[in-house]
């Protein structure tokens, strides 16, 4: 379960892929799309809140509750809209939500190199956010092999 | 209980090359980075880089990617930094540390090995 | 690099005292900011993490405050086992970067 129901902490960044790519975020017909973009150079960046939560880590082998905690985020682009992992479309929506948010739209955290960052899914261990045909997508991540897939890192910049 | 214990102090000859250990117990050791920092005697704490158990994957500072090489055996829960081309420099003790959070470094290192002794002396 | 500037480098205090470590990063570093104590002779010991939160099993007279670019570790009513240097640590972003470290000793 999450620590409480508030953040620790709260901080607007964008979002940009490994290759630098922009995600963007576009209002169509009443729904927003997510976009991964080149941007013109003299487009603003998107900006997305991301409100961190610390949460027990389940595969403790402890079980003492000291040991095993992670860092989980959600994502919110714009008021009210939260990031969603999809696991049944493999897909990462966005969708207008009320709090208490569900568990869709909590990741874990991960630090990579070059402060690179990885979001994993909450609901479905193993799977990342990522990119595919320039979208957002989820992905499988085998951990043995592909951690540092470039396709699921992530950089924020404030 | 987490723990992290080190192999022994090393004296070693300017120009060679030294391995250092760190076996992991009391947790799930594919799960949490392990990070390497250096202290020097009488001096303050650098943070050589990390590697995830679970994967191999590493990040290094870059002042250390030309002396350090960091590398697991999930098969025996140790982690190993190897030290190259030896010199007075680089005489310290060595810890090995676990993160706090799983695979997130923002909330430092919970738990540290004793620490080896690398001596450095011809 | 975010740079880590702690004061002051030493401190002597008597026993019973309130006393103050200031740390302040070169960048915003949000909360992520860590407080570890070494003893002489002995392994870095997380105090704080999180800015203020405390680590299991320290004593509740260790108080860490702050966020962004400016962070406090106060020791309330000085203890003699509390004799040690003390670091932050920026957990921000790579290289994680330590303060040059307050020594503590008694008067």
């Known amino acids: 379960s999450i620590t409480g129901i508030s953040p620790i902490t709260e901080s607007l960044a964008s979002l940009s892929t490994y290759n630098d790519q922009s995600i963007t975020f576009a209002l169509e017909d009443e729904s927003y799309e997510i976009y991964v973009e080149d941007l013109k150079k003299d487009k603003k960046k998107d900006k997305v809140l991301l409100s961190y939560y610390e949460s027990q880590h389940p595969s403790s082998e402890s079980g003492d509750g000291v040991d095993g905690k992670m860092l989980m985020v959600t994502l919110s682009p714009t008021k009210d809209f939260w990031l969603q992992a999809n696991n049944k479309e493999h897909s990462v929506e966005l969708h207008k939500c009320e709090k208490p948010l569900p568990d869709q739209a909590f990741f874990v955290l991960h630090n990579r190199s070059f402060n690179c960052v990885s979001f994993e899914c909450k609901t479905d261990p193993g799977v990342f956010i990522g990119v595919k045909d320039n979208h957002l997508a989820l992905i499988k991540v085998d951990y043995s092999e592909n951690l540092g897939s470039e396709n699921i890192l992530f950089k924020l910049s404030e | 209980q987490v723990q992290l214990q080190q192999s022994g102090n090393d004296l070693v000859k300017p120009g060679a090359s030294v391995k250092l250990s760190c076996k992991a117990s009391?947790?799930?050791?594919?799960?949490?980075?392990i990070n390497w920092i250096k202290q020097r005697p009488g001096q303050g704490l650098e943070w050589i880089g990390r590697i995830a158990p679970g994967s191999g994957f590493i990040s290094y500072n870059e002042l250390f990617k030309d002396k350090a090489t960091l590398t697991v055996d999930t098969s025996s829960s140790t982690a190993y930094i190897q030290l190259g081309s030896l010199s007075s420099e680089d005489s310290a003790v060595y810890f090995c540390a676990r993160e706090f959070y799983y695979g997130s470094f923002y909330g430092g290192f919970a738990y540290w090995g004793q620490g080896t002794l690398v001596t450095v002396s011809a | 690099d975010i740079q880590m500037n702690q004061s002051p480098s030493s401190l002597s205090a008597s026993l019973g005292d309130t006393i103050t470590i200031t740390c302040h990063a070169s960048q915003n570093i949000h909360v992520w900011l860590s407080w570890y104590q070494q003893k002489p002779g002995n392994i870095p010991k997380l105090l704080i993490y999180?800015?203020?939160t405390l680590h299991t099993g320290v004593p509740s007279r260790f108080n860490g405050s702050g966020s962004g670019t400016g962070f406090t570790l106060t020791i309330s009513s000085l203890q003699p086992e509390d004799i040690a240097t003390y670091y932050c640590?920026?957990?921000?972003?790579?290289?994680?970067?330590f303060g040059a470290g307050t020594k503590l000793e008694v008067k």
């Open positions: 640590q920026q957990g921000q972003s790579s290289p994680l970067t």
């Open positions: 999180k800015a203020s």
């Open positions: 009391g947790y799930t050791f594919t799960s949490y980075w």
